[in-house]
Amino acid sequence: HHHHHHPASVQLHEAVELHHWCIPFSVDGQPAPSLRWLFNGSVLNETSFIFTEFLEPVANETVRHGCLRLNQPTHVNNGNYTLLAANPSGRAAAFVMAAFMDNPFEFNPEDPIPVSFSPVDTNSTSGDPVEK
């Protein structure tokens, strides 16, 4: 089925903290969609402090999982993160609101993080940013 085209789809999940913070995402589509992040509506400049990182691909699957990695974000990083995915068959978007503290360890998982989703195409969903 790999040669068949299917439209881009994208999912965002809640941010989690590992050695760093991660906004997990899943993206699907054939051919593999191009990705672009927006922060508060503007193109996000990726650097060694904020960057996209993919997990190892699973054999025979077109879906890719990854993180937008943020190194100990502060209030500067609070806002709306949008992931845009596009391929020749379609485009999709998902967004999530992330609220970070100056100190990630002060994050209270019981405080709800508001999440909204604006479908640009079908098959796009969003969760909360989570702490890994």
């Epitope: 050695h19 760093h20 400049n45 650097t47 060694s48 402090f49 960057f51 990182e53 190194n71 100990q72 974000p73 502060t74 209030h75 500067v76 990083n77 100056d102």
Partner: antibody
């Protein structure tokens, strides 16, 4: 305790090349990018580039492209910076630093002197 | 590239005085500013990241503030061990850039 230990500096003739090392310890080497900086008296700090040991990805300052190559050996937790076609302008202290919360841990620096 | 301009270039203060160092960016750097302390013959040490967050172990007499293009580092009560050069840097967009530094001397 996070530590970055630099080595490899010294006296090199113009036109020569040199490979500087930055050995990391006290943290997961492949989880963080490493930055390299150049410092000369009266010039402040100059960012040379960043290297991500997990993937080999690099970002270079355009001013250093062709002059510098960043690599790493994951098995020894060591990052390297190769400098080529050296001139007197390359004489400086070179520093590696972990890209964590800002450049949060720095090596002690290693001095390169280019002279005939 | 973004130019970071620090002022003053040098400062001479007595122990116990309050000091404010300035760092101005040539364009908006979104709060991605760090402050570094470099003592004589040592490598830089991170004091402040994200414009206002103190790095681990940094004394609370060091405070960072500012946003967009104007940033300050305040030392509420200067100590003898604060003799150093202080550098600001932006890690908002490549190439990362640093200011020329402010040298703090103790009277």
């Amino acid at each position: 305790e996070v530590q970055l230990l630099e080595s490899g500096g010294g006296l090199v003739q113009p036109g020569g090349s040199l490979k500087l090392s930055c050995k990391a310890s006290g943290y997961a080497f492949t989880n963080y990018w490493l930055g390299w900086m150049k410092q000369r008296p009266g010039h402040g700090l100059e960012w040379i580039g960043d290297f991500y040991p997990r993937t080999g990805n690099t970002f270079y300052n355009e001013n250093f492209k062709g002059k510098v190559t960043l690599t790493a050996d994951k098995s020894s937790n060591t990052a390297y910076m190769q400098l080529s076609s050296l001139t007197s302008e390359d004489s400086a202290v070179y520093l590696c630093a972990r890209a964590g919360t800002g450049f949060d841990y720095w090596g002690q620096g290693t001095t390169l002197t280019v002279s005939s | 590239e973004i130019v970071m301009t620090q002022s003053p270039a040098t400062l001479s203060l007595s122990v116990g005085e309050r000091v404010t160092l300035s760092c101005k960016a040539s364009e908006n750097v979104g709060g991605y500013v760090s402050w570094y302390q470099q003592k004589p013959d040592q490598s830089p040490k991170l004091l402040i990241y994200g414009a206002s967050s103190r790095h681990t172990g940094v004394p609370d007499r060091f405070t960072g503030s500012g946003s967009e293009t104007d940033f300050t580092l305040t030392i509420s009560s200067v100590q003898a061990e604060d003799l150093a050069a202080y550098h600001c840097g932006q890690n908002y967009i490549y190439p990362f850039t640093f200011g020329g530094g402010t040298k703090l001397e103790i009277k």
